[in-house]
Interface confidence: low
Amino acid sequence: PHLRTFTDRFQTCKVQGAWPLIDNNYLNVQVTNTPVLPGSAATATSKLTIIFKNFQECVDQKVYQAEMDELPAAFVDGSKNGGDKHGANSLKITEKVSGQHVEIRAKYIGTTIVVRQVGRYLTFAVRVPEEVVNAVEDWDSQGLYLCLRGCPLNQQIDFQAFHTNTEGTGARRLAAASPAPTAPETFPYETAVAKCKEKLPVEDLYYQACVFDLLTTGDVNFTLAAYYALEDVKMLHSNKDKLHLYERTRDLPGR
Amino acid sequence: SPCKILKCNSEFWSATSGSHAPASDDTPEFCAALRSYALCTRRTARTCRGDLAYHSAVHGIEDLMSQHNCSKDGPTSQPRLHTLPPAGDSQERSDSPEICHCEKSFHKHSATPNYTHCGLFGD
């Protein structure tokens, strides 16, 4: 999947299986990514587990789990808030669009999470105070979690190079440039560009991600995934000057 | 936890959060709130030895005291109940705490935290 980190780096990761996105004293988020096509290096998110850890007299531990074709509007225990404690309403799940869009507010840690199902796959977005991100037991022993440190270099796909290689080549793009088996030949580059332009008029990294996804999979739902990802940034990002990321902000992963 | 630093943090936060914005940096009220905060941390010091939140609060108070030329002696403030800021960015507003400290219990030195964003989508 495409990842925008807490430090506004933009990466395309081919990580497969379960990986931690966020891990601190208050919150643990783990995603499971699966290949979009058999043998493909490109992966998308098929499962998401969010654990809100037991916190003082505010909330009980709550676990939220979403999978492909199952986007519940409740925690795994069936509740929609933080439990029986007096601050239980400082953690709430709201269903925005049934089966497609859920928002979780954890006011006790100033955090908003948006989970969507777009097509077959899930998208995730979070707005969280830096204090919460930095509230970890022991910095030295922290593992690799993606929102903070980005993907390992060997797990990244250079989709911008892919974008450059495919530009103007139509359906006859070089197979070597593709990180996945060739998507249906009926989906030429020009069509991908047109579909992405329709939803994402600014040629930023979200637009480029959209083009990459359409060429990789031939699945038009990925246009919506990029569109909603940008919409979530508009809602959740505190710096309105950083909504659109461009090629120059591309960076190597963290430690 | 026997360490009550989070209570001190939230009391300071509510004392410096009015109906519109944090108390103006240069007002006597801000210094009074800082002195209350310092007093609160001293009261809980014995049970907070080694607590990261406690030590960062103590250092933060010292920094703020010197930044704002607050004298160590002087009046202290009572924490006041926080009311939500006026209409503006709806996201800012709805993430802000309400009266219950559970609505935002982690603040240390600033009424408005620095927010950060992470997103994952597509393939």
Epitope: A18, P20, N25, T49, N54, V63, A135, E137 | L6
Partner: antibody
């Protein structure tokens, strides 16, 4: 040297409570969580719960909810586990263990264990 | 009973390799990157041997290795030695599950 030293063996009657202590040394106590694990005679290991000395956050095994309380005293770098309404099946060796990373991920240093016998 | 299944016992001669399996569900093992293994000698406290599926803490001999395939995690001891005779437990954290396997007795013949 990182060490966890536990309190001595206890004999309790059914219905009573027991409080086991675990004193940490050789590292910053608030930088690591503490898990508690028990082992009945001849049986396997059983995870009881976890506490963060940093924040006071706890998470208890579902089956012990309501009977177990974990606390810490950061001034003495000591963790405590109290189990109430004891029954004979609570007879076990109780271990505290330092958590290496995150709340539950692995336990890298263990106490020597405290035998708690529940008998009428 | 435990939701992580281990064989009751495995045995091998000195110098041989033995593998202990730990089978769970997709949430407890398959999707978890947090599987650890513990060695326990009789009357002693457990000792961490592997964490995060494959990582070895300092001081643990490199004859101990870990892997995972599907919903099964494995601990392999290659070049078995007399002091490896002990009970071994797998442990996994994923989502709602935090649990130990039932334990495997390793006997050095």
């Amino acid at each position: 040297e990182v060490q966890l030293v536990q309190s001595g063996a206890e004999v309790k009657k059914p219905g009573a409570s027991v409080k086991v202590s675990c004193k940490a040394s050789g590292y910053t106590f608030t930088s690591h969580g503490i898990s508690w694990v028990r082992q009945a005679p001849g049986q396997g290991l059983d995870w009881m719960g976890w506490i963060s000395p940093y924040s006071g956050n706890t998470n208890y095994a579902q089956k012990l909810q309501g009977r177990v309380t974990m606390t810490t005293d950061t001034s003495t770098s000591t963790a405590y586990m109290e189990l109430s309404s004891l029954r004979s099946e609570d007879t076990a060796v109780y271990y505290c263990a330092r958590v290496g990373s995150g709340p539950y991920y692995y336990m890298d240093v263990w106490g020597q264990g405290t035998l708690v016998t529940v008998s009428s | 009973q435990s939701a992580l299944t281990q064989p009751r016992s495995v045995s091998g001669s000195p110098g041989q390799s033995v593998t202990i399996s730990c089978t769970g569900t997709s949430s407890s093992v398959g999707d978890s990157i947090y599987v650890s293994w513990y060695q326990q000698h009789p009357g002693k406290a457990p000792k961490l041997m592997l964490y995060d599926v494959t990582k070895r803490p300092s001081g643990v001999p490199d004859r101990f290795s870990g892997s995972k395939s599907g919903n099964t995690a494995s601990l392999t001891i290659s070049g078995l030695q007399a002091e490896d005779e002990a009970d071994y437990y797998c442990y996994s954290y994923a989502g709602t599950d935090t649990l130990f396997g039932g334990g495997t007795k390793v006997t050095v013949l």
